[in-house]
Interface confidence: low
Amino acid sequence: QPEQKASNLIGTYRHVDRATGQVLTCDKCPAGTYVSEHCTNTSLRVCSSCPVGTFTRHENGIEKCHDCSQPCPWPMIEKLPCAALTDRECTCPPGMFQSNATCAPHTVCPVGWGVRKKGTETEDVRCKQCARGTFSDVPSSVMKCKAYTDCLSQNLVVIKPGTKETDNVCGTLPSFSSSTSPSPGTAIFPRPEHMETHEVPSSTYVPKGMNSTESNSSASVRPKVLSSIQEGTVPDNTSSARGKEDVNKTLPNLQVVNHQQGPHHRHILKLLPSMEATGGEKSSTPIKGPKRGHPRQNLHKHFDINEH
């Protein structure tokens, strides 16, 4: 609805009346509206609401609202809708971050690595190798390295020491034996809470060049692995957006374990223990999977001398 005068407006703008050539000082229109009729010697300016699909952020003296930016390109989602007062703002959805004008899935820290810094909509996850006394037994983009189980506090002993990838295995020792391996029938207590029930391996896909049985599961989200490792990395002179083929060249012992999460199918790149033979540590060459999705439009910045 057009309105004649909004209260508490302090801003004014200068307008040249084309009929008389006179320079007039008119009151600005409030944010969310535009000047549908400029003031004259005898009348106030008239403001009208921005039509659907347009906006003005500030009080203004402009004759047409700004067009909202295009709908968010996949896989982006709307952070702010297109409304009379706001332009559409796009952001990356949960589990992804903005990278090179599109959204990329957060890095999945592999087994033996934990999350050093959580990912956000603008920043990738940072991974770090599990320090002494901690481990990570599942690939995850959210889990930190966990401390080993304290066997002693449970009146148990360490049957098998933990590694970067496995927890301590606790057990009881028969009093008559000084052996460090459990005798048959001895209870061993792994920590069940470390098994993430939402990521149960169901099938394995081994890259080209390795013998495997192809999984016939349906399509899957393709996370990246180790794209932003901080500790223990080697200098990264590799491409930051390698395709599938380069992943296999860089890490020849890579396996993709197809974890089924309810209706979801997720490929998780998992480093194989055989890599430790090269020097005790896992390869930490940063890897990026191909970026999917669509570049964000250049959200046009509007500036008008009669706005603000």
Epitope: W74, P75, I77, C92, P93, P94, G95, M96, C103, P105, K208, E214, S218, A219, V221, R222, G243, K244, E245, G262, P263, H264, H265, G289, P290, R292, G293, H294
Partner: antibody, heavy 128, light 107 residues
Framework: EVQLLESGGGLVQPGGSLRLSCAAS????????MQWVRQAPGKGLEWVSV????????MYADSVKGRFTISRDNSKNTLYLQMNSLRAEDTAVYYC?????????????????????WGQGTTVTVSS | DIQMTQSPASLSASVGDRVTITCRAS??????LNWYQQTPGKAPNLLIY???RLQSGVPSRFSGSGSGTDFTLSISGLQPEDFGTYYC?????????FGGGTKVEIK
């Protein structure tokens, strides 16, 4: 049995409109994104449009943008393609197809995969 | 848009032959390529997705390979029901685009 059945094709004059329907059965329709693909007589396949499982996101080929509208009614397990301002070059068999799996929409993002279920097609002829 | 170019446009083969069809993308599409078979008067049928993964229910004589821009579909021992037209399709980005097709005919 998983099935898609298109209907609504026919002969229409240039500038006219048609609405195609695609009835889905045998699967949870609301979990899948759906596509329209067309094939002109004696020609190859051309992708037309995609719609997300909820219907909240759509995308179109440049050749139909602004003229065609994809929509869906999950309560009726039906996909639609509203075709306006039809041209002779829109003459084709129109197929609806199911994206092979799209639950990742529920995480807020989407990846494109193969179309694993197709309808038998419905013929649209635009001619004066 | 990403252009997909298939070759050959057509080929003649006999039952039992090994057939290879190639598909080239105008820009890298990593491994995001699907293959379909279409027989006359019927809808296409998904054979391979993600360049090399066999769709459920598709015979193992079909195989796919390649990444980046160059891809191959192989049929190792052509069967009578394999005659028809084969299409590649990139699933890297919208708009989804198909190759022009390769018609496999009986020699």
């Amino acid at each position: 049995e998983v099935q898609l059945l298109e209907s609504g094709g026919g002969l229409v004059q240039p500038g006219g409109s048609l609405r195609l329907s695609c009835a889905a059965s045998g699967f949870t329709f609301s979990r899948y994104s759906m596509q329209w693909v067309r094939q002109a007589p004696g020609k190859g396949l051309e992708w037309v449009s995609v719609i997300s499982p909820s219907g909240g996101s759509t995308m179109y080929a440049d050749s139909v943008k602004g003229r065609f509208t994809i929509s869906r009614d999950n309560s009726k397990n039906t996909l639609y393609l509203q075709m306006n301002s039809l041209r002779a070059e829109d003459t084709a068999v129109y197929y609806c197809a199911r994206e092979s799996y799209s639950s990742s929409w529920y995480s807020g993002y989407y990846y494109y995969y193969g179309m694993d279920v197709w309808g038998q097609g419905t013929t649209v002829t635009v001619s004066s | 848009d990403i252009q997909m170019t298939q070759s050959p446009a057509s080929l003649s083969a006999s039952v039992g032959d090994r057939v290879t069809i190639t598909c080239r993308a105008s820009q890298t599409i990593a491994g995001y390529l699907n293959w379909y078979q279409q027989t006359p008067g019927k809808a296409p049928n998904l054979l391979i997705y993600d360049a090399s993964r066999l769709q459920s229910g598709v015979p193992s004589r079909f195989s796919g390979s390649g990444s980046g821009t160059d891809f191959t579909l192989s049929i190792s021992g052509l069967q009578p029901e394999d005659f028809g037209t084969y299409y590649c399709q990139q699933s890297y980005t919208i708009p989804l685009t198909f190759g022009g097709g390769t018609k496999v005919e009986i020699k």
